[in-house]
Interface confidence: low
């Protein structure tokens, strides 16, 4: 058979035998001519091996280009493909040669030394025993053992090729220790060597390259990636490698087996790239293949190499952050470096550190942002190496969505006598400023009410309070601003002129970070009412009583109770007066009953008014026809008990005669001090020139005279002590004389 | 009876615009969020945009943000939207609605953006 | 932005039959802020519930809305041949304001 390259000009060299198949008796000789173009070698079944000197190779004489093989007493063994061929070249000429030797039908080639047949448990894979025969026609058959099993050629995939050997599913003899052919001539039995089986695994379970992903590097330094495969136990494995630059001198490329740690199921294959120095020509794409034979697998990293450190902000980087008071804001640092930076943060000037409201790094994270954050952050990148610096600063402006003051009071339903004129109030701060408040209402039975939740009034629609038909007329007043706790905030107040239907109001305020609600419970009512004896606001120690009055004819059961704390978690059902619903919860006081000739009048007397008895009060009555209860709230404030201060400076004055003079004795104190005036160090009595008023604070001298002038004192006293201001009144001018005669 | 009626739709070329009314009457306008919802041939409801009762305060859907502007004036009670930059993927019929709950609609305009 | 899922898509039923109709919020929605319509060919729709379950004036007491978070329902107690329209759910709790994508119901 001549073999060459399609289109090659060069003729395959002629053998003496023109067949591709010589069979020749044992100990006979084999002689072959080979004629070619140029020059020629042979190789035989094989080469080399030690009784090398037994095949002659030889100039032919009569030709340059011609070698003449010859094999004396040729054996079984023999048996195999001779070939000559043209050197440096794929051209060649080749003859099969059968040597039949009948006591070893079975050749026995250098390979086979060994033994050893590897097998995988695939069960498409084939196996090849390399029991190939001297002679062409034999029947053989393979045995494998132990247990003892014979396997015969079938025709399709059990076949025996004398060229080959025996060919058999590699599951078939995978349980065995050891296989060899058995071939019968002549009644005769002749047996191949033994193979032995040897079960190999195949499957790499994964490749991984360390250090993964891209890998920076400054031009120069030494790059190790690291190919590690995991692979099923009795793996052979081979690496290979791609890489960038063909320059492989630099590159060192070492594989090793990884000791398996006790009683995994898995092997470890390492193979180690090593550049001692990187170019920029080693950038690039680096892949790592692992072959098992069956199986490939692969991993590739990129390997990015800089001939300089360099550093620069990316172009996403934000310099205005704008969020919502409570969220979490992050700063992300996008950045363009080799190698990595240090990133340092600063607030108006000061380095931040982590700590567990704000996270330093990549990126700065504020976990709960506060207005108190709004300000300036400069962030600065050092380059390590090259100690190049980059700084970009980001404002950061919080916006905090309207929050309504009055909302914050956790206080029970207030309700409204009847006919009243009452003040609703909405104290709103937001950031930016507000786009407007609005107010709105709605009637009370056209809403329903669900305590457990953050809203607890839906009403299906809300009405402009500007049209308040079929409800309380209203005013709405300018928007007042005031600066409350250190913020500007607007006050919007809702006038209800008088008080005739049981409504909610809202008023709703809107800005650019979002919108926040105040609904108000306007719950009126004919019932009960409550007042307070003395009419002035209590302070404590002093003696003073709570009324509940109620018309005779339609109440009765009038009863006290005090809203303590325990009642915020009492479930307040589906009323709009949810404290009537849960009265047992409340603390029942005991009153005092006095009758005239319409009213009862429920008395809580305290004689003796301590802060403790602060707190919300209900006045509750039963309507006799429908015995539904009606309930009425009071807060009650106790004042703390204060010693008297002049709040303010007393001037001295200077007037003339004739003049007016008013000075005011600023003063603060509970109880209410006891104002005295004194004009050097005695009384001062009211007369046709001297008034006092609003309980002697104000002091009015009309018409002075010369002996006005004076020092003047403002005592102010109560329970505690008292307290002195002087003032000094100088009178100008002469003195007329009234003429008596 | 509260009633709302919506004119100005009709056939636009990509890229144009139209400006659609909305007539309110039987009702207080000035004290009711306004919005407009549209509905494409065949397929289902979309919330355009809303307006609260003084205008001050507006929102819009994201496919229509920068494009579209609603307005109102509550003397004449009447609701707007402008359409600006017009896509076919803005055909639909538009229904101008009342209150958050939206609970009156027009009979709707039909926009229709073709070349 | 909160994604609404009706389901089924379409339901064919029979005069005097029950219908329950199902709407899921991609995420928690206020009860006070959900809404049921009906809208009828060639018609606007019409608000029926509000408020996950408060009937809107002039229903019929035959419609029922119920539910709380993600999960709300519309039932049609007896279906009358009127009721034949597609039936869209909507909430307002978030900016911005979502549809369902509708249930039809067809009456047999």
């Known amino acids: 058979a001549s073999v060459g390259l399609p289109g090659d000009s060069l003729h395959p060299p002629k053998l003496s035998t023109q067949k591709d198949i010589l069979t020749i008796l044992a100990n006979t000789t084999l002689q072959i001519t080979c004629r070619g173009q140029r020059d020629l070698d042979w190789l035989w079944p094989n080469t080399p091996r030690d009784s090398e000197e037994r095949v002659l190779v030889t100039e032919c004489g009569d030709s340059i280009f011609c070698k003449t093989l010859t094999v004396p007493r040729v054996v079984g063994n023999d048996t195999g493909a001779y070939k000559c061929f043209y050197r440096d070249t794929d051209v060649s000429s080749i003859v099969y040669v059968y040597v039949q030797d009948h006591r070893s039908p079975f050749i026995a080639s250098v390979s086979d030394e060994h033994g050893i047949v590897y097998i995988t448990e695939n069960k498409n894979k084939t196996v090849v025993i390399p029991c190939r025969g001297s002679i062409s026609n034999l029947n053989v058959s393979l045995c494998a053992r132990y247990p003892e099993k014979r396997f015969v050629p079938d025709g399709n995939r059990i076949s025996w090729d004398s060229e080959k050997g025996f060919t058999i599913p590699s599951y078939m003899i995978s349980y065995a220790g050891m296989v060899f052919c058995e071939a019968k001539i002549n009644d005769e039995t002749y047996q191949s060597i033994m193979y032995i089986v040897l079960v190999v695994g195949y499957r790499i379970y994964d490749v991984v390259l360390s250090p993964p992903h891209e890998i920076e590097l400054s031009a120069g330094e030494k790059l190790v990636l690291n190919c590690t495969a995991r692979t099923e136990l009795n793996v052979g494995l081979d690496f290979s490698w791609q890489f960038p630059s063909s320059k492989h001198q630099h590159k060192k490329i070492v594989n090793r087996d990884v000791k398996s740690l006790p009683g995994t199921v898995a092997k470890m294959f390492l193979s180690t790239l090593t550049i001692d120095s990187v170019t920029k020509s080693d950038q690039g794409e680096y892949t790592c293949t692992a072959y098992s034979g069956l199986m490939t697998k692969k991993n590739k990293t990129f390997v990015r190499v800089h001939t300089k450190p360099f550093i620069a902000f990316g172009s996403g980087m934000k310099s205005l952050v704008e969020a919502t008071v409570g969220s979490q804001v992050r700063i992300p640092v996008k950045y363009l470096s080799y190698p990595a930076p240090d990133i340092k943060w600063y607030r108006n000037g000061r380095p931040i550190e982590s700590n567990y409201t704000m996270i330093v790094g990549d990126e700065l994270t504020i976990m709960e942002v506060s207005e108190r954050d709004a300000g300036n952050y400069t962030v600065i990148l050092t380059n390590p190496i090259s100690m190049e610096k980059q700084s970009h600063m980001v404002s950061l402006v919080v916006n905090v969505p309207p929050q309504i003051g009055e909302k914050a009071l956790i206080s029970p339903m207030d309700s409204y006598q009847y006919g009243t004129m009452q003040t609703l109030t909405c104290t709103v701060y937001a950031n930016p400023p507000l786009h407007h408040i609005q107010w709105y209402w709605q009637l009370e039975e056209a809403c329903s009410y669900r305590p457990s939740q953050t809203n607890p009034y839906t009403c299906k629609e809300w009405r402009h309070v500007k049209d308040f038909q079929g409800g309380n007329k209203i005013e709405v007043t300018k928007n007042q601003y005031a600066l409350i706790e250190g913020k500007n905030k607007t006050v919007s107040t809702l006038v209800i002129q008088a008080a005739y239907v049981s409504a909610l109001y809202k008023c709703e305020a809107i800005n650019k970070a979002g919108r926040g609600e105040r609904v108000i419970s306007f719950h009126v009512i004919r019932g009960p009412e409550i007042t307070v004896q003395p009419a002035t606001q209590p302070t404590e120690r002093e003696s003073m009583s709570l009324l509940c009055t109620a018309d005779r004819n339609t109440f009765e059961n009038l009863t006290w109770y005090k809203l303590g704390s325990q009642a915020t978690s009492v479930h307040m059902g589906e009323s709009l007066t949810p404290v009537c619903k849960n009265l047992d919860a409340l603390w029942k006081l005991n009153g005092t009953v006095f009758s005239n000739s319409t009213n009862d009048i429920l008395i809580v007397a305290f004689q003796n008014a301590s802060l403790q008895d602060q707190g919300n009060y209900v006045c509750s009555a039963q309507d006799k026809k429908t015995k539904k209860r009606h309930c009425l709230v009071k807060q009650l404030v106790i004042l703390e008990r204060m010693a008297p201060m002049i709040t303010g400076n007393l001037e001295n004055q200077t007037t003339t005669i004739g003049e007016t003079i008013e000075v005011v004795c600023p003063t603060s104190g509970n109880p209410t001090p006891l104002i005295t005036w004194f004009k050097d160090n005695e009384t001062l009595v009211e007369d046709s020139g001297i008034v006092l008023k609003d309980g002697n604070r104000n002091l009015t001298i009309r018409r002075v005279r010369k002996e006005d002038g004076g020092l003047y004192t403002c005592q102010a006293c109560n329970v505690l002590g008292c307290a002195r201001a002087e003032t000094l009144f100088i009178i100008e001018g002469v003195q007329e004389k009234t003429n008596l005669e | 009876e509260v009633q709302l009626l919506e004119s100005g739709g009709g056939l636009v070329q990509p890229g144009g615009s139209l400006r659609l009314s909305c007539a309110a009457s039987?009702?207080?306008?000035?004290?009711?969020?306004m919005g407009w919802v549209r509905q494409a041939p065949g397929k289902g409801l979309e919330w355009v945009s809303s307006?609260?009762?003084?205008?001050?305060?507006?929102n819009y859907a994201d496919s229509v943000k920068g494009r579209f502007t609603i307005s109102r004036d509550n003397s004449k009670n009447t609701l707007y939207l402008q359409m600006n930059s017009l896509r076919a993927e803005d055909t639909a019929v538009y229904y101008c609605?009342?209150?958050?709950?939206?609970?009156?609609w027009g009979q709707g305009t039909l926009v229709t953006v073709s070349s | 932005d909160i994604q609404m899922t009706q389901s089924p898509g379409t339901l064919s039923l029979s005069p005097g039959e029950g219908a329950t109709l199902s709407c899921r919020a991609s995420?928690?929605?206020?009860?006070?802020?959900f809404g049921w319509y009906q809208q009828k060919p060639g018609q606007a729709p019409r608000l029926l519930i509000y408020g996950a379950s408060s009937r809107a004036t002039g229903i019929p007491d035959r419609f029922s809305g119920s539910g709380s978070g993600t999960d709300f329902t519309l039932t049609i107690s007896r279906l009358e041949p009127e009721d034949s329209a597609v039936y869209y759910c909507?909430?307002?709790?978030?900016?911005?304001?979502?549809f369902g994508g509708g249930t039809k119901v067809e009456i047999k």
């Open positions: 995420q928690s929605v206020s009860s006070n802020y």
């Open positions: 909507q909430q307002f709790d978030s900016s911005p304001l979502s």
């Open positions: 307006i609260y009762p003084s205008g001050g305060a507006t």
């Open positions: 609605a009342r209150g958050n709950y939206l609970d009156y």
């Open positions: 039987g009702f207080t306008f000035s004290w009711y969020v």
